[in-house]
């Protein structure tokens, strides 16, 4: 689609005569008829296939034609066409004398023709005017012409339709050849695809408008390149969404179980050596002179009762000293000068001669020990209490005071926190050394699965055409609220598409 434009510039008819040679009375009141048609090797009469146009009376005899494009648009003359410009044409320009005001062909005498010119040739679409001058024996016509494309038409033949737009169907202007030129921030064949923020992760991010970076579920950060760890992950990281890969020294589903209590809490005192023995469990190996679960108690060197055979122990700065009873000697009063005749066995112990009476041995009754049955048995010396339990002597017996979470005679049994079914809504209970943990079914969360959480059905962006997605909490399904002009359960069907829609 385009326009053939003809600009009449000057017409010379000095003698004021008609084509027949007869003079006009009083002068030649001149108007023009223009016929534009397809290329003919010899321009002949017939239909003006590309169009016709007539002017009003422009002057008398000889005159210049004023450029009137700004005023009424009469000069240049406009011959619009609604087809692909073929590149060739034939043009007939007739100058006529108007005796009266009626310029219709049937109202004019046949000899009112002043002059007629016919040209044909090639003409490319362009802004430049071609100047031409045609001279006959009596007249001269100077004019120029060109072919330009109509608004929104482009290309060598004005055949390429392109209308700039900035809406859902595209964001572009048109180049001189009719190709699209995307507006800043848009790309794609029809400039419908926004260019996301520079660096926005190709898979994990997307955008609905330029320079935006929206993250897909499970990703975060300005460029959507940081994964979101599992909700509740304490001492862990992720490399893909919803992971919880534990830092060194931590365990459990949420990496909140302390596997390295020694490093994280340094529980052993007085230079003791700490050994991890499970989640939140440890053992302290005390240096000489210290005792207690955490080696927090300082031992007197006499506390280990080093003096035998009833010897009494005295603490000294550089150690200890044993004061031996009569009949004994040695560093720990371990050597005897007694025999059974001296009744050396205390607390009802029985004496047995050895080495032909040179020595003896005492057989002690229950609850007593020592070479002379002089010591009460300390039932705690063998550390019988497990899991850090504290041993207490109670007369002839002993008992273990257990740490929280343990029970049994020797604190050997875990207290089962799961026995009372603490996990709600079908959650699975796991016994841990420092408590319990619930694994919740889909749709529930919280420490005891007591919180109902909706499965976000909208997370997968199921709706088309920028429809708004809502999650139906009662059914955990999505509902798409369609914008005007779209239907379907996911708003996937446009009701109508304009003819210029870029499919």
């Amino acid at each position: 689609s385009g326009v053939f434009q003809l600009q009449l510039q000057e017409f010379i008819n000095e003698r004021g005569v008609l084509a027949s040679g007869r003079p006009c009375e009083p002068g030649c009141r001149t108007f023009f008829r223009v016929c534009l048609k397809h290329f003919q090797a010899v321009v002949s009469p017939g239909p003006c296939t590309f169009g016709t146009v007539s002017t009003p009376v422009l002057g008398t005899n000889s005159f210049a034609v004023r450029d009137d494009s700004s005023g009424g648009g009469r000069n240049p003359l406009q011959l619009p066409f609604n087809f692909t410009w073929p590149g060739t044409f034939s043009l007939i320009i007739e100058a006529w004398h108007a005796p009266g005001d009626d310029l219709r062909p049937e109202a004019l005498p046949p000899d009112a023709l002043i002059s007629k010119i016919a040209i044909q040739g090639s003409l490319a679409v362009g802004q430049n005017w071609l100047l031409d001058e045609q001279t006959s024996t009596l007249t001269r016509l100077r004019y120029s012409y060109r072919v330009i494309c109509s608004d929104n038409y482009y290309g060598d033949n004005c055949s390429r339709l392109c209308k700039k737009r900035n809406d859902h169907f595209g964001h572009y202007v048109c180049q001189p050849d009719g190709n699209l030129s995307c507006l800043p921030g848009w790309t794609g064949e029809y400039c419908q695809q926004p260019i996301c923020l520079s660096g926005c992760h190709e898979q994990n991010g997307y955008c609905s408008k330029p320079a935006e970076c929206l993250c897909r579920p499970g990703w975060q950060g300005r460029l959507c390149n940081e994964c979101i760890p599992h909700n509740g992950c304490r001492h862990g990281t992720c490399s893909t969404p919803w992971q919880c890969t534990c830092d060194e020294g931590w365990g459990g589903l949420f990496c909140d179980q302390d596997l390295n209590y020694c490093t994280h809490h340094s529980p052993c005192k007085n230079g003791a050596t700490c050994s991890n023995s499970g989640q939140r469990s440890y053992t302290c190996t005390c240096r000489p002179g210290y005792t207690g679960v955490d080696c927090e108690l300082e031992l007197s060197e006499c506390d280990s009762n080093p003096c035998r055979n009833g010897g009494s122990c005295k603490d000294q700065e550089d150690g200890y000293h044993c004061l031996c009873p009569p009949g004994y000697y040695g560093l720990h009063c371990e050597h005897s000068t007694l025999s059974c005749a001296d009744s050396p066995c205390f607390n009802g112990g029985s004496c047995r001669e050895r080495n032909q009476g040179a020595n003896y041995a005492c057989e002690c009754p229950p609850n007593f020990t020592g070479s002379n049955c002089e010591k009460k048995v300390d039932r705690c010396t063998s550390n019988p209490c497990a899991n850090g339990g504290q041993c207490l002597n109670r007369g002839p017996s002993r008992m273990c005071r257990c740490r929280p979470g343990f029970t049994g005679t020797y604190c050997e049994l875990h207290v089962s926190d799961c026995a009372r079914n603490p996990c709600a809504h079908g959650g699975t209970c796991h016994d841990l050394e420092n408590g319990l943990m619930c694994t919740c079914p889909a749709g529930f969360s919280g420490r005891r699965c007591e919180v109902r959480t909706s499965i976000d059905a909208c997370a997968s962006s199921p709706c088309f055409n920028r429809a708004t997605c809502y999650t139906d909490l009662s059914t955990d399904t999505f509902v798409c609220n369609c914008p005007y002009g779209f239907v379907g359960s996911r708003c996937e069907f446009p009701v109508g598409l304009p003819p210029s829609f870029p499919w």
Epitope: Q193, Q203, Y206, S461, P462, F464, S489, F493
Partner: nanobody
Framework: EVQLVESGGGLVQAGGSLRLSCAAS????????MGWYRQAPGKQRELVVG???????HYADSAKGRFTISRDDAKNTVYLQMNSLKTEDTAVYYC?????????????WGQGTQVTVSS
């Protein structure tokens, strides 16, 4: 690549019937919506009927009571049964499949099949 091929168009007298078929290839379409559009000369392309992935159907007012959409997922084919045809049903009928991949929307169209209803 996804391809849609329509068939079944032709010349029919007013009041007659036609059955259009759209065969899809290049993917499995059981989870996709499918639809039929038509375009008369000089007019905009308009929805005739669509069937969503959940099986719900959406008819234009002009198609209600006369046209029926159905699908055969085993054959990857959608059908349009057109009864009581009128001269104003004359148009090129296009098959349409909207697809959403990784948040981006794509529209696949067939080449169209001409339906002409004569009086």
């Amino acid at each position: 690549e996804v391809q849609l091929v329509e068939s079944g168009g032709g010349l029919v007298q007013a009041g007659g019937s036609l059955r259009l078929s759209c065969a899809a290839s290049g993917s499995t379409f059981s989870n996709y919506a499918m639809g039929w559009y038509r375009q008369a000369p000089g007019k905009q392309r308009e929805l005739v009927v669509g069937i969503s992935s959940d099986g719900s159907t959406h008819y234009a007012d002009s198609a209600k009571g006369r046209f029926t959409i159905s699908r055969d997922d085993a054959k990857n084919t959608v059908y349009l049964q057109m009864n009581s045809l009128k001269t104003e049903d004359t148009a090129v009928y296009y098959c349409y499949v909207p697809v959403k991949v990784a948040g981006l929307e794509y529209a696949y169209w067939g080449q169209g099949t001409q339906v002409t209803v004569s009086s």
